[in-house]
């Protein structure tokens, strides 16, 4: 929800998560705040406290679950409010009716691990974390490696089209650091987006044996 | 502030027809969404209709669906409710709110509205 210099928007990380951020330019910064979410076919209510990120916005985590339970599905509605105190009372200020599977963002993989490394390759694998068992094969990854005396932003993208958790880097330099980074994204939902990029994996390729390019 | 009237109540026979007129004043910039509430006396308040701020979207309890129209008039800050086929269980004080929160939810409450109007009588004979 967007409306002047206000902003309401939130993910489902397609398990037990859904992370909430309100912007709202003015606002005072020591407003207390919070997001309920009301699910529109299940039992359960959560609340989280809204805690500042920055100048004019705050975020929280509505924990759903355990980390690995399946807590909605596709045909979930979640309302979900912003609720501040002003004096006495609670004043809605944002609202959505949030559906999960429409606005997915999964967590970052882990467990990166170099399988194999050359002079001019090296075979990464990784794992998803957290990702709904409904995505089956529909995932699809982007992948970066940092060379020296570059930016990540420099770095050129590697696309995934396919559940593959797993990628062979070719013509790399001998004896030089590297490091990588990957991220994933369902296929499904309308306002869908990339995950964040996992932590970097730094690796070494093996030096150039003597007398050989 | 906002301030919200109402007008257009009245008796009607069962089957009849009313339209009920919302007019706002004050800081109008900051309202969004608008709604009709009914309450009969020994009764919660409980939602009739709502509209967005663009009129959009709209949204109805089931037992007036098909049978009334909320609609809003920017340029004259006023939101109507076009009541058709009245039924004797419609009767009710008929009560005008809006809200400064922005988006959009099916599932508006009481607690969602910020500004309230006084209400006007609706009773539909039989």
């Known amino acids: 929800a967007v409306n002047g210099t206000s902003r309401f928007t939130c993910f489902y990380n397609s398990r037990a998560n859904i992370s909430c951020v309100w912007s709202q330019d003015g606002a005072l910064q020591d407003t207390s705040c919070q997001v309920h979410a009301w699910p529109d076919r299940r039992r359960w209510n959560q609340t989280c406290e809204l805690l500042p990120v920055s100048q004019a916005s705050w975020a929280c985590n509505l924990i759903l679950g355990t980390p690995d339970s399946q807590k909605l599905t596709a045909v979930d509605i979640v309302t979900l409010r912003v609720m501040c105190r002003e004096g006495v009372r609670w004043r809605m200020m944002a609202i959505q009716d949030f559906k999960p599977f429409e606005n997915l963002r999964l967590m970052a993989p882990i467990s990166l691990q170099v399988v194999h490394v050359e002079t001019h390759r090296c075979n990464i694998s990784w794992k998803i974390s957290q990702a709904s068992h409904y995505f089956e094969r529909h995932l699809e990854f982007e992948a970066r490696t940092l060379s020296p005396g570059h930016t990540w932003e420099e770095a050129p993208l590697m696309t995934l089209k396919q559940k593959q958790e797993w990628i062979c880097l070719e013509t790399l330099t001998p004896d030089t650091q590297y490091e990588f980074q990957v991220r994933v994204k369902p296929l499904q939902g309308e306002f869908t987006t990339w995950s964040p990029w996992s932590q970097p994996l730094a690796f070494r390729t093996k030096p150039a044996a003597l007398g050989k390019d | 502030e906002v301030q919200l009237v109402e007008s257009g109540g009245g008796l009607v026979q069962a089957g009849g027809s009313l339209r009920l007129s919302c007019a706002a004043s004050g800081s109008i910039f900051s309202i969004n969404a608008m709604a009709w509430f009914r309450q009969v006396p020994g009764m919660e308040r409980e939602l009739v209709a709502a509209?967005?701020?663009?009129?959009?979207?709209?949204v109805y309890r089931d037992s007036v669906k098909g049978r009334f129209t909320i609609s809003r008039d920017n340029s004259k800050n006023t939101v109507y409710l076009q009541m058709n086929t009245l039924k004797p269980e419609d009767t009710a004080i008929y009560v005008c709110?809006?809200?400064?929160?922005?988006?959009?939810?099916?599932?508006?409450?009481?607690?969602?509205?910020?500004?309230w109007g006084q209400g006007t009588q609706v009773t539909v004979s039989s």
């Open positions: 709110a809006a809200t400064r929160a922005i988006g959009w939810t099916a599932r508006w409450i009481t607690t969602d509205f910020d500004f």
């Open positions: 509209i967005s701020r663009d009129g959009g979207a709209s």
